[in-house]
């Protein structure tokens, strides 16, 4: 579990001068966070989500301090990089530096792989992750995105069971779900989520979230989201925040109804949806007649099934 690269709290921690009361308070909070993080390595993954929630809470607190700390940013980012390298070296348990490690598409980007397409991420024995084929978006908004979901052809059904959503399904070159276990591992460090959508009229929209975490299987791959930015109208994923993942054979929603069976997908169903990005793909002509389609209520409402969707993630501290 790697939550070390948490950019904002790390800066006040290093600021030795100007010990105003707020900075002292923040230092105490960050110190508390550090102890929690070291304890996290020894604890079972069951405890992980509660720590993430505290991280997110601290993040919101520290953001209030951000304007006072901008002058020190360049000095401390260099120190942060050194700390990151040490932590990654420890995680690798071999002599290679963090620059050599490839965790996701952002790592590949930093190693000058700048062409979007399919890449193989090497296995990581320390993190327990096998070799993984991923599709990297190296262009959008600076690049470095690992795509975790795509809907474009409609040939692959997303009405799948828990095991398939866990392991992943579909073709990495076409429509696919990367797999909750893989997404969970990729979101162990502070991560951003970007959702891109296209309607049947060719309009493009996006939603981006400052923080994205997927819990582990013990926590039913629960979704945690930070702040929303974007141009897709209302935020239709916030309703699903802090909600467990459900599939047709595992009902973890907050409803008497079995949302996964009603909405015909696997998703973080609440009761049931403000969005349903893993819903049924409906083609033009059928796209505006169904409640179980690929929907984003804040844009086209509850019965408009989108033509194309991509969900992608990259580290919060990624710099193109």
């Amino acid at each position: 579990q790697k939550l070390s690269k948490h950019k904002t709290p790390a800066q006040p921690q290093l600021k030795a001068a100007n010990c105003c009361e707020e900075v002292k308070e923040l230092k105490a909070q960050v110190a508390n966070l550090s102890s929690l993080l070291s304890e996290l390595n020894k604890k079972q993954e069951r405890d992980w989500v509660s720590v993430v929630m505290q991280v997110m809470e601290l993040e919101s607190n520290s953001k209030r301090m951000e304007s006072r700390l901008t002058d020190a940013e360049s000095k401390y980012s260099e120190m942060n990089n050194q700390i990151d390298i040490m932590q990654l070296q420890a995680a690798q348990t071999v002599t290679q530096t963090s620059a050599d490690a490839i965790y996701d598409c952002s790592s590949l980007y930093q190693k000058n792989y700048r062409i979007s397409g399919v890449y193989k991420l090497p296995p990581d024995d320390f993190l327990g992750s096998p070799e993984l084929e991923v599709f990297c978006d190296m262009e959008t908004s600076g690049g470095g995105w690992t795509i975790i979901q795509r809907r474009k052809s409609g040939l692959v059904s997303f009405y799948r069971d828990w095991k398939q959503y866990k392991q992943g399904f579909g073709s990495i070159r076409g429509d696919f779900w990367l797999g909750n276990e893989h997404i969970h591992r990729l979101s162990r460090q502070p991560t951003r989520l970007r959702v891109e959508m296209e309607d049947w009229e060719g309009n493009l929209r996006y939603a981006e979230y400052s923080h994205f975490v997927l819990g582990n299987e013990l926590n039913s791959y629960r979704l945690f989201l930070g702040n929303y930015t974007g141009n897709v109208g209302n935020d239709a994923l916030q309703y699903h925040n802090n909600t467990a993942f459900s599939t047709k054979d595992k009902d973890n929603d907050n409803c008497l109804d079995k949302c996964a069976q009603l909405r015909k997908g696997g998703y973080w169903y609440n009761c049931c949806t403000d969005s349903n990005l893993n819903g049924v793909y409906y083609r033009l002509g059928e796209h505006n007649k169904h409640l179980d389609g690929i929907t984003w209520y804040g844009w086209h409402g509850s019965t408009y099934s989108l033509k194309r969707v991509e969900m992608k993630i990259r580290p919060e501290d990624f710099k193109p």
Epitope: G170, G174, D175
Partner: antibody
Framework: QITLKESGPTLVKPTQTLTLTCTFS??????????VGWIRQPPGKALEWLAL???????QYSPSLKSRLTITKDTSKNQVVLTMTNMDPMDTATYYC????????????WGQGTLVTVSS | DIQMTQSPSSLSASVGDRVTITCRAS??????LNWYQQKPGKAPKLLIY???SLQSGVPSRFSGSGSGTDFILTISSLQPEDFATYYC?????????FGGGTKLEIK
Amino acid sequence: QITLKESGPTLVKPTQTLTLTCTFSGFSLSTSGVGVGWIRQPPGKALEWLALIYWNDDKQYSPSLKSRLTITKDTSKNQVVLTMTNMDPMDTATYYCAHNPDYGDFFDYWGQGTLVTVSS
Amino acid sequence: DIQMTQSPSSLSASVGDRVTITCRASQSISSYLNWYQQKPGKAPKLLIYAASSLQSGVPSRFSGSGSGTDFILTISSLQPEDFATYYCQQSFSTPLTFGGGTKLEIK
């Protein structure tokens, strides 16, 4: 070009275990999205899907036969093996293996099939 | 499980005829419907996938339509080699299920 071929016993006694091997060429079962399925057809009857194994070792089974079926793959040998326990005369059928493309759960290439008769 | 019902179960037609075979799903399956042709003693052959997409190498006289629960396979002008049994199959949800088949015979 994609080809598949089933092999295994043509005659099985009741209660015995059937082991069928599908040997394929022209594709790799390590390619994202790809799968190999087994389908059977009793004489003069319709097709019945049995099992499917994907590139990532995800295995799907017909619920009515799940307790009797096991599907495995050997990617390096380009083989998929189906075992079916406790065979019964009702299991007499032609057994096909087929290629499941990376873009959907259907079967675009089929083996020639092998007729398995269950009789004492 | 999703049940697939084909009609008719058998059909007599002549060369040059336009023929339609229907397939009905027990619940909505969007466009996740595929059609196969099988000749005696041979393996099935994929004709149409995703309700209306023609598989590579299949003659254009074959076409598929429909969405939701009702689907149609059309052969616009029957050829001698088209006399066979036709099966529909849903790929919306496991278990994957086939229809009972439609046997197309020479009148």
